[in-house]
Interface confidence: low
C-alpha cells in the first residue's frame, strides 16, 4: 500500500503456544505406616487434564482418588491436585521383597509427565537391641567404649544416650564422642563419669531402652612418701628403728587396687652407748697453808663421760682446817663467804 | 609416662610378610584404642587399622583389608600388625597411637617393600 | 568412606602472621575432628581433638572451631617453631586424615 502510516498487518498470525507438558508442583513423598493408621500420598500438577496413581505397576481405581481443581496461591496458576489413602493392609498384601511404591502420572495436551517414586513401607522397631551396652570397671584416664546396636527398625531408629538418666550431649562436653555406630566413647574417664549408661533408640513407631550399663571409674591407691625413720629402739647398743609409709597418694577408690607392697620397714641400729663419768680417787692432802687450810683434789677421769654420758656430781676439791706449818691464825677462815669450797661447774675445773 | 615403642620394620619382597609390635608403657591398653597409621616417604598420614583389645574390636582402612591383621597381647601390653602379601605402596614409617583423637605416637618403624 | 578435604595444601607465613587452615568433611561428622601437628622425621602431636578443645600443654595461640561440617584450625601469630605441616583427622566413622598443610617461612 501507498498510505504512508498505515499499518502492514501479517499474512497470518502465529498459533498459540502449545500447552506444555504437566509439571509437578508436589510430587508424592515417601510415608510410614504406624500401627493400622493408612497414609495419604498427594499429587499436584499443572498444567494437567488428568492426574492418577499407579502403585506398584497397576492403576489405582478412579473411585480410589479424591481429585480437585484450584489456583495455586503462589503461582496463581489453575493446578489440578490428587490424593490416595494407602492402608497396612494394602502393603501387607503385596508379596516379594520389593517395597510398596506409588506415582503419580499427569496429563497435558502435550503429553505425559510421571511423578518420582514414593514408597510406603510399614513402620516399625523391633523390641531386642542387637548389641546392648556392658558395665565395666576402669581406671581412672582411660578410655571408655560403651557399644549399643539398636533394634532393627523401619524407618532406621536413631540413638542417644542417657547418663543417669540424661541425654549426653558431645557438644557440650566434649569428653564423651558418638560414633556413627552408635558406641559411645569416654575419651578419659573423670571420676564423675561413675554413672548408669543407657542407649535408647527411637522412630516414629516406639522407643526402646536397652539393658543400663554401669560404668564404674576406679582408682588404685598409690603410696605417700616414707615417714622419716623412727628413733633405735634402745638407747644404747642394738636396736631397731622403722618408718611408715599411707595408702593415700591417691586412696584407692570405688573399688580400686590396694597398695601393693609393705605399708612399714623395720632395720636394725646401733647406737653407741653412753658412758657417765667417775671420779678418780682423791690425791694426798696437801700441806698446811697460811690460810690454815689444807686441800686434796680429784679429777672426772674415770672414766670422763663419752657419746653423751653424764658428767660426775660433786666437788673437785675438798678442804679443811689445819693449825700446824704456816698457819696464822688471824687469816681467812673456813667460814668465809670466799671459802674455797669449789663445786664442778659446766666442765671446767676450778682449782 | 605414656610411651609407645614400634619395632620390627624392615626391608621385604614385594608378595612378604612382616609383623610389627608396639609395645606400651605408662597405661594398660586393654582400656585404650591402638592405631596403627603409616606415612609414605614424602606424603601425608594414612590411617590403617585400629583395635580396642578390652572387645578384641577392630577395624581395617579399605587398602590392607584381608592383607593386614591388627591384634594384641594385653599381658605383654603390646599391640601387633601382621602385614602379609605386601605391595611397593605400602612403603611407608609405620606408626603405632593411642585415642580416639591420637594423643601419643611412637617415633615410628620403617618398612620398605622393594625387589 | 568419608573424605577430608584440607585446604590450602601449602602457605608462606611471617612469623607474627595469623594462620587459617581449614577442613571439609564430606558429611556429618558432628565435632570428631582432631588436628595435628608434624615436623620432618618425627611423629605427629595433637593440638585439638573434639574440634576446639586445646590438649593438655599446647600454646593458647592455636585454637579449633567447627561450622557445620567446616572445621578451623587458627594460629593467632605464628612463632619460629609453628613451621611445620598441619594435618586435620576425623574419628567419627572410622578415622581419616587430611592431605596436609605445610606452613613455610616466607
Known amino acids: 500500500g501507498t498510505d504512508s502510516g498505515s499499518e502492514v498487518l501479517p499474512d497470518s498470525f502465529p498459533s498459540a503456544p502449545a500447552e506444555p507438558l504437566p509439571y509437578f508442583l508436589q510430587e508424592p513423598q515417601d510415608a510410614y505406616i504406624v500401627k493400622n493408621k493408612p497414609v495419604e500420598l498427594r499429587c499436584r500438577a499443572f498444567p494437567a487434564t488428568q492426574i492418577y496413581f499407579k502403585c506398584n505397576g497397576e492403576w489405582v481405581s478412579q473411585n480410589d482418588h479424591v481429585t480437585q481443581e484450584g489456583l495455586d496461591e503462589a503461582t496463581g496458576l489453575r493446578v489440578r491436585e490428587v490424593q490416595i489413602e494407602v492402608s497396612r493392609q494394602q502393603v501387607e498384601e503385596l508379596f516379594g521383597l520389593e517395597d510398596y511404591w506409588c506415582q503419580c502420572v499427569a496429563w497435558s495436551s502435550a503429553g505425559t509427565t510421571k511423578s518420582r517414586r514414593a514408597y510406603v513401607r510399614i513402620a516399625y522397631l523391633r523390641k531386642n537391641f542387637d548389641q546392648e551396652p556392658l558395665g565395666k570397671e576402669v581406671p581412672l584416664d582411660h578410655e571408655v567404649l560403651l557399644q549399643c546396636r539398636p533394634p532393627e527398625g523401619v524407618p532406621v531408629a536413631e540413638v542417644e544416650w542417657l547418663k543417669n538418666e540424661d541425654v549426653i550431649d558431645p557438644t557440650q562436653d566434649t569428653n564423651f564422642l558418638l560414633t556413627i555406630d552408635h558406641n559411645l566413647i569416654i575419651r578419659q574417664a573423670r571420676l564423675s563419669d561413675t554413672a548408669n549408661y543407657t542407649c535408647v533408640a527411637k522412630n516414629i513407631v516406639a522407643k526402646r531402652r536397652s539393658t543400663t550399663a554401669t560404668v564404674i571409674v576406679y582408682v588404685n591407691g598409690g603410696w605417700s612418701s616414707w615417714a622419716e625413720w623412727s628413733p633405735c629402739s634402745n638407747r644404747c647398743g642394738r636396736g631397731w628403728q622403722k618408718r611408715t609409709r599411707t595408702c593415700t597418694n591417691p586412696a584407692p577408690l570405688n573399688g580400686g587396687a590396694f597398695c601393693e607392697g609393705q605399708a612399714f620397714q623395720k632395720t636394725a641400729c646401733t647406737t653407741i652407748c653412753p658412758v657417765d663419768g667417775a671420779w678418780t680417787e682423791w690425791s694426798k692432802w696437801s700441806a698446811c697453808s697460811t690460810e690454815c687450810a689444807h686441800w686434796r683434789s680429784r679429777e672426772c677421769m674415770a672414766p670422763p663421760p663419752q657419746n653423751g654420758g653424764r658428767d660426775c656430781s660433786g666437788t673437785l676439791l675438798d678442804s679443811k682446817n689445819c693449825t700446824d706449818g704456816l698457819c696464822m691464825q688471824n687469816k681467812k677462815t673456813l667460814s668465809d663467804p670466799n671459802s674455797h669450797l669449789l663445786e664442778a661447774s659446766g666442765d671446767a675445773a676450778l682449782y | 609416662e605414656v610411651q609407645l615403642v614400634e619395632s620390627g620394620g624392615g626391608l621385604v619382597q614385594p608378595g612378604g610378610s612382616l609383623r610389627l609390635s608396639c609395645a606400651a608403657s605408662?597405661?594398660?591398653?586393654?582400656?585404650?584404642?591402638i592405631h596403627w597409621v603409616r606415612q609414605a616417604p614424602g606424603k601425608g598420614l594414612e590411617w590403617v587399622a585400629y583395635?580396642?583389645?578390652?572387645?578384641?574390636?577392630?577395624y581395617y582402612a579399605d587398602s590392607v583389608k584381608g592383607r593386614f591383621t591388627i591384634s594384641a597381647d594385653t599381658s605383654k601390653n603390646t599391640a601387633y600388625l601382621q602385614m602379609n602379601s605386601l605391595r611397593a605402596e605400602d612403603t611407608a614409617v609405620y606408626y603405632c597411637?593411642?585415642?580416639?583423637?591420637?594423643?601419643?605416637w611412637g617415633q615410628g618403624t620403617l618398612v620398605t617393600v622393594s625387589s | 568412606d568419608i573424605q577430608m578435604t584440607q585446604s590450602p595444601s601449602s602457605l608462606s607465613a611471617s612469623v607474627g602472621d595469623r594462620v587459617t587452615i581449614t577442613c571439609r568433611a564430606s558429611?556429618?561428622?558432628?565435632?570428631?575432628v582432631a588436628w595435628y601437628q608434624q615436623k620432618p622425621g618425627k611423629a605427629p602431636k595433637l593440638l585439638i581433638y573434639?574440634?576446639?578443645s586445646l590438649y593438655s600443654g599446647v600454646p593458647s595461640r592455636f585454637s579449633g572451631s567447627r561450622s557445620g561440617t567446616d572445621f578451623t584450625l587458627t594460629i593467632s601469630s605464628l612463632q619460629p617453631e609453628d613451621f611445620a605441616t598441619y594435618y586435620c583427622?576425623?574419628?567419627?566413622?572410622?578415622?581419616?586424615f587430611g592431605q596436609g598443610t605445610k606452613v613455610e617461612i616466607k
Open positions: 597411637a593411642r585415642g580416639y583423637g591420637i594423643d601419643y
Open positions: 605408662g597405661f594398660n591398653i586393654s582400656y585404650s584404642s
Open positions: 583395635i580396642y583389645p578390652y572387645y578384641g574390636y577392630t
Open positions: 558429611q556429618s561428622v558432628s565435632s570428631a
Open positions: 573434639s574440634a576446639s
Open positions: 583427622q576425623q574419628h567419627y566413622s572410622l578415622f581419616t
